[in-house]
Amino acid sequence: GYKAEVMVSQVYSGSLRVLNRHFSQDLTRRESSAFRSETAKAQKMLKELITSTRLGTYYNSSSVYSFGEGPLTCFFWFILQIPEHRRLMLSPEVVQALLVEELLSTVNSSAAVPYRAEYEVDPEGLVILEASVKDIAALNSTLGCYRYSYVGQGQVLRLKGPDHLASSCLWHLQGPKDLMLKLRLEWTLAECRDRLAMYDVAGPLEKRLITSVYGCSRQEPVVEVLASGAIMAVVWKKGLHSYYDPFVLSVQPVVFQACEVNLTLDNRLDSQGVLSTPYFPSYYSPQTHCSWHLTVPSLDYGLALWFDAYALRRQKYDLPCTQGQWTIQNRRLCGLRILQPYAERIPVVATAGITINFTSQISLTGPGVRVHYGLYNQSDPCPGEFLCSVNGLCVPACDGVKDCPNGLDERNCVCRATFQCKEDSTCISLPKVCDGQPDCLNGSDEEQCQEGVPCGTFTFQCEDRSCVKKPNPQCDGRPDCRDGSDEEHCDCGLQGPSSRIVGGAVSSEGEWPWQASLQVRGRHICGGALIADRWVITAAHCFQEDSMASTVLWTVFLGKVWQNSRWPGEVSFKVSRLLLHPYHEEDSHDYDVALLQLDHPVVRSAAVRPVCLPARSHFFEPGLHCWITGWGALREGGPISNALQKVDVQLIPQDLCSEVYRYQVTPRMLCAGYRKGKKDACQGDSGGPLVCKALSGRWFLAGLVSWGLGCGRPNYFGVYTRITGVISWIQQVVT
């Protein structure tokens, strides 16, 4: 019998350029008579153009929704009703070719052509894109709050905020031909639920989405987004009702930045420079293509690429890369944003050099990518350390912490977290090395203590980059480094002259002069520690709630002992900057550290002094008894303590704690406490210091109160942010 042909709606969006008309401001106002009149004419012309081609039989509907510069650009969509089997044959490219062919055929024609009655359409200025019914619905929902803006070269245009009576608005942005638009979004409120989507075309076409941002992101307080050309659309969707704009938008045209470099590397190890996508840290634009050619001076070296919060992975089944495609020596890799550092190591087998290509395969982009490049020795990629094949990083070996996700850095260790005697491979504890007393059979633990040694897991690196064998030589009163750098910055870690925490005891004034109380509206929220004249360190999770993210809320008290009263040694500060570790992950508690910059420097006194910061190589020996301090609850679920409490806890080996916590403990965490419970940090102690006393009498910051299961529960230790695991970030910020 007869079977009706199945017809489907195919939606197209696009723009065309009219050469004999000029854009005027009237055409930006949808309610103006000029707009209505121009729309009617343009719509008639568009319909006539489509029906003049063989597409005419499929024509369903069309709409011109906006105008722009150039001399006059019309933006439109149309729907064709086509047989299902012909769907793939009428791609946007085919439809564009048919319409261009029609326009070209009538350019020199003297015959009357309906669509040319009023308009001279430029065949080269016609663009047809794939769209969907959903895209048209999204577009229509913004038309009540539609803003067109043209931004000229050298201009920075601040866009007018959204109409709060509308639920959705669209900014249609256009710049000079051959330039690209750069949009800057700055969130101005701590909390909101607004959503902004940026598109690489004039309207909200899902397939041309560059990125979407949501709800006053604290991770990205400022976002800069690049379009691939001179047109862009931004769509706002209302969140919570607010009389204040939660964001500021500004746009400027920028020139295309070439992304091609030829470099010859020097004959030295470590980082030699930086490669980045155009306008870094702006989001890279759709259609970005970078090509970097690096020449290596000798086949002894390999090329290392060090990434920050970005990794390269093999992509299965040739799927497109959603976060950037890389080709390195004909290997295709996909970028992936992660909250970890990563290095890609490229073995060099020929002197021709290495070409690295980066391409944005889809319109969806992301934060600009920056990579440090340098050389490594192919025969010994990580001198004194272990090469973690999972992430390409050099990590300490046999230090008792599984730094490599597969744990191979702690496998096959003769001596784990101890010193291996040369004579017979016996292991002695690290504090016995270079302590003036031979413990190894032939005294190898006391050899080379006055000279430079190859750098390794437990060696201390001096400022001149040489290393010393003596563990933890910082601030012990005798210079071990040739340049004396182990005894610099040592005005720290000394207690004042002085005679919550579960199972603790009350502290006296000046006993813990680095202890900070972080308060909001007069209420103690978290602990912290003074580490420099203008910096207090604490836990990132103290600022987890959006309502706690603003610096203006916080007051920092130093020299405090009692919460309900003040004494002369006490001082308070406002916070000028709040920096969370860029890799902090709320769910896993990883990298749980934040830095607060005080509004003015501290004046040191017996009651206010900084704690000493350990070097990355500082070894806090498991078993060591250290102290935690804070005003946290004295029992699980209880109120905070009025007096500053102190309690001693024992440092626990990483592998044991990891097993007890079922492998939720990362290398940036350190465990301490008592198996019997009863002594532990509790709510309100968060961010407070875990400090250990060195033989010199100085106190070093080992950890920050981070998390745990309840407080003082038997079987569960307290988990702390391991300072040696985040010290490079701390030093980078503070110095």
Epitope: G623, H625, Q650, I652, K676, P714, N715, F717
Partner: antibody
Amino acid sequence: QVQLVESGGGVVQPGRSLRLSCAASGFTFSNFDMDWVRQAPGRGLEWVALISYDGSKKYYADSVKGRFTISRDNSKNTLYLQMNSLRGEDTAVYFCAKEGYGGYDGFDYWGQGTLVTVSS
Amino acid sequence: QSVLTQPPSVSEAPRQRVTISCSGSTSNIGNNAVNWYQQLPGKAPKLLISYDYVVSSGVSDRFSGSKSGTSASLAISGLQSADEADYYCSTWDDGLNGVVFGGGTKLTVL
């Protein structure tokens, strides 16, 4: 490489005293709580006493409270058990044991034991 | 009379699996970590399991520990003749303020 070596055991008459020592090596003695555990011939294990890493806290089994004293000398890496008013039921092999990390209840290293015989 | 109760003896054939139980009360097992020791004839005890289930380094993974409420158990799979020994459970007791042991279980591999 952790080693615990007990000494001081022997035959002693009821009511008399004896002092046991335990020499420790291969670990940082001053960081760990230490215990004495005993085992009467053909019987099970019985905990005797515990001392905290710094000597500030001491715990005893009810059966020895008031008669035995646990102590330590961290400078000598040595643990002691002073046993006074000895009774026949104190006859046992006395083990010195090192607490695991976190203290109070897991003995990760034991000495070989020293035999104390209380007999007239 | 021990504070923690263990069966005096258990026996099983080689390559089989055996479980030794240890029961106590809220003040000990219910509130604290359980440890298991193996004592071979004429030797000092050796820590097998701490923290209810953490296998000590150097100990075969044929040994496993578990705890539920006020009871704990030690399981040994793939029994070998070398496993013949006395096995003790132990924990801290909050009421007695001290360490308590079970009476011990003699394991015989048939």
